[in-house]
């Protein structure tokens, strides 16, 4: 069964910068990736970026840069302009489409123990959902 993993990181050098990493584990080629975000209760979400392997990428604030890392994974850099960190309680969702096979989504958020003052970020633990 195809699966999607999501990892959210706070950048150690800039407390206002976050990066969302998403990847697709499964057969088939990716036809579109959509990254969205919203509150922890699943309400009030909106799109952050759309990545198409041929047509390019579109992104919306506060997304700063969306890019392909591999043919089946992407990263999205976010810039928090606020004094505090609203991203801390935010849910980020990545949906990968593989036409005509189907599409799959998984969501994740910044780990509550994230502290950029500590050592290097821990090994990513994929958050998986296979519906």
């Amino acid at each position: 069964t195809p699966e999607v993993w999501v990892q959210v990181q706070m950048e150690a050098t800039e407390l206002s910068s976050f990066t969302v990493h998403c990847g697709f584990l499964g057969p088939g080629s990716i036809s579109l990736v959509t990254v969205s975000w919203g509150g922890p209760d699943g309400a009030g979400g909106t799109k952050l970026a759309v990545l198409h392997p041929e047509l390019g990428t579109r992104q919306w604030a506060p997304a700063r840069q969306a890019r392909w890392e591999t043919q089946s994974s992407i990263s999205l850099a976010l810039e928090d302009s606020g004094a505090s960190s609203p991203f801390a309680n935010t849910t980020f969702c990545c949906k990968f489409a593989s036409f005509p096979e189907g599409s799959w989504e998984s969501c994740g958020s910044l780990p509550p123990s994230s502290d950029p003052g500590l050592s290097a970020p821990p090994t990513p633990v994929p958050i998986l959902r296979a519906d």
Epitope: G45, T46, L55, K95, E105
Partner: nanobody, 127 residues
Framework: EVQLVESGGGLVQPGGSLRLSCAAS????????MSWVRQAPGKGLEWVST????????SYVDSVKGRFTISRDNTKNTLYLQMNSLRAEDTAVYYC????????????????????WGQGTMVTVSS
């Protein structure tokens, strides 16, 4: 896996009405823009309407403005298309899709350009 299941299609006389529904599952429906697209017999895919994630913004192709209304219920994970004053030229398979084709300014649409897609429901307008 994401599932989009359309219903509500059928045979209707010109001037009649239909309400299409699209039941979504397997993803956070309330986070995503949704659209309706259609494919008339022997024709290419045509964008019909889009609604943003919180239903605060809608848009329509000129040929259906004033006749069709897109809406959504995020508590029920369902997308709707109310179609009034139907015409023969509205005859098509109607697909519920996740995404907004205007993201890339697509002139020639394909289902592969959307994030998710349903199997479609047939609407036939004929007397």
């Amino acid at each position: 896996e994401v599932q989009l299941v359309e219903s509500g299609g059928g045979l209707v006389q010109p001037g009649g009405s239909l309400r299409l529904s699209c039941a979504a599952s397997g993803f956070t429906f309330s986070y995503y823009d949704m659209s309706w697209v259609r494919q008339a017999p022997g024709k290419g895919l045509e964008w019909v309407s889009t609604i943003n994630s919180n239903a605060g913004r809608t848009s329509y192709v000129d040929s259906v403005k004033g006749r069709f209304t897109i809406s959504r219920d995020n508590t029920k994970n369902t997308l709707y298309l109310q179609m009034n004053s139907l015409r023969a030229e509205d005859t098509a398979v109607y697909y519920c899709v996740e995404g907004d084709p205007h993201n890339f300014g697509l002139e020639s649409l394909s289902l592969r350009d959307f994030g998710s897609w349903g199997q479609g429901t047939m609407v036939t307008v004929s007397s």
